[in-house]
């Protein structure tokens, strides 16, 4: 939702969290603002306090329940409002009718581990976190490997077009330190975006055996 120079963007993690960012040029830093969530068909509502993340933007997380509980479904619509205190009154600064499963951003994958490492290849697995059972297997992943002397931005992206929570990295250099990251995205949702990248997993390939090419 955009009003003039105001921007209000929220994502649902598919379980029990809606994260919101509100930015407004010229807003006062010390103003007290909140996000209010009112589902259209549920008995609960929720509020979070917007905290500054930069000069003109604020963020907060609406915690709807325990991390793995399915608090919203595919047919829910949530009215989200930014409310700011002006003296003794609250003023509405932004509003949107939010369809949670059209605006998804999952949690970053977790539990990255090296399953098997050789001189030229490495098998890595991970788990998805707090993802709805609704997606069945209809998720995709992107992965990247950081090579020595390069930046993450230079790393080519590898795409896994199905729910595959492992990868076999090939053509690696022996006895070399690498880092690996992965992110996840459901197919569902017009405004759905990639999860944050996972924490990097560091690993080292095995040295080449002397006198033979492995």
């Amino acid at each position: 939702a955009v009003n003039g120079t105001s921007r209000f963007t929220c994502f649902y993690n598919s379980r029990a969290n809606i994260s919101c960012v509100w930015s407004q040029d010229g807003a006062l830093q010390d103003t007290s603002c909140q996000v209010h969530a009112w589902p259209d068909r549920r008995r609960w509502n929720q509020t979070c306090e917007l905290l500054p993340v930069s000069q003109a933007s604020w963020a907060c997380n609406l915690i709807l329940g325990t991390p793995d509980s399915q608090k919203l479904t595919a047919v829910d619509i949530v009215t989200l409002r930014v409310m700011c205190r002006e003296g003794v009154r609250w003023r509405m600064m932004a509003i949107q009718d939010f369809k949670p499963f059209e605006n998804l951003r999952l949690m970053a994958p977790i539990s990255l581990q090296v399953v098997h490492v050789e001189t030229h290849r490495c098998n890595i697995s991970w788990k998805i976190s707090q993802a709805s059972h609704y997606f069945e297997r209809h998720l995709e992943f992107e992965a990247r490997t950081l090579s020595p002397g390069h930046t993450w931005e230079e790393a080519p992206l590898m795409t896994l077009k199905q729910k595959q929570e492992w990868i076999c990295l090939e053509t690696l250099t022996p006895d070399t330190q690498y880092e690996f990251q992965v992110r996840v995205k459901p197919l569902q949702g017009e405004f759905t975006t990639w999860s944050p990248w996972s924490q990097p997993l560091a690993f080292r390939t095995k040295p080449a055996a002397l006198g033979k090419d492995t």
Epitope: Q70, T73, V75, H133, Y134, E136
Partner: antibody, heavy 117, light 107 residues
């Protein structure tokens, strides 16, 4: 292998109630959605509703809301669809199907219900 | 309720030829459109999700595309087992609704 096996054909009188079962195997029933769909003779498909076994919630299409009840027994991995106040236009094949909320990935073989006086 | 209109109602095509089936939504549904195939006496089978994503195990000759509110299912080279009824279904607005179907028959 994912399988949904439905109960057999039924013949009912107008005003009666029918209850169809859908026994599933090959996936975790407790973390699934089971949909029900009606297909009247020579007509298209009509989505009736679903049960979300994890969330313990049901969702019904407005056209069926007053007469349909979807339930599940997680101890036997079986879903049920009960349709009450039957009329002749309820004569149809009824399907259960597994999926996410948005589409139906695996279907049962269908149960024919005939409503006739 | 969103109305899904499929055209044509019946399509006659020779084996080996290309078949193009259309599905139009009465309002914008983003990419929330799914295709099913139904053969006589059988349950429907899911073919394509979100307008263009093929389901694993479905032959590569089946493909989907979208232009605004119009969605197209294309079968590039018809096999004998492809002659069936095809349904589209939207999942953008509750309740989910199906098109009335296109019957694909042998010419």
């Amino acid at each position: 292998e994912v399988q949904l096996v439905q109960s057999g054909a039924e013949v009912k009188k107008p005003g009666a109630t029918v209850k169809i079962s859908c026994k599933v195997s090959g996936f975790n029933f407790k973390y699934s959605l089971i949909h029900w769909v009606q297909q009247a003779p020579g007509k298209g498909l009509e989505w009736m509703g679903w049960i979300d076994n994890e969330a313990g919630e049901t969702e019904y299409a407005p056209g069926f809301q007053d007469r349909v009840t979807i339930t599940a027994d997680t101890s036997t991995d079986t879903a049920y669809m009960e349709l009450s106040s039957l009329r002749s236009e309820d004569t149809a094949v009824y399907y259960c199907a597994r999926g996410g909320p948005w589409f139906l990935s695996y279907w049962g073989q269908g149960t024919t219900v005939t409503v006739s006086s | 309720e969103i109305v899904m209109t499929q055209s044509p109602a019946t399509l006659s095509v020779s084996p080996g030829e290309r078949a193009t089936l259309s599905c139009r939504a009465s309002q914008i549904i983003s990419n929330n459109l799914h295709w099913y195939q139904q053969k006589p006496g059988q349950a429907p089978r899911l073919l394509i999700i979100y307008g263009l994503q093929s389901i694993s195990g479905i032959p590569a000759r089946f493909s989907g595309s979208r232009s605004g509110t119009e969605f197209t299912l294309t079968i590039s080279s018809l096999q004998s087992e492809d002659f069936a009824v095809y349904f589209c279904q939207q999942s953008n607005n509750f309740p989910w609704t199906f098109g009335q179907g296109t019957k694909l028959e042998i010419k």
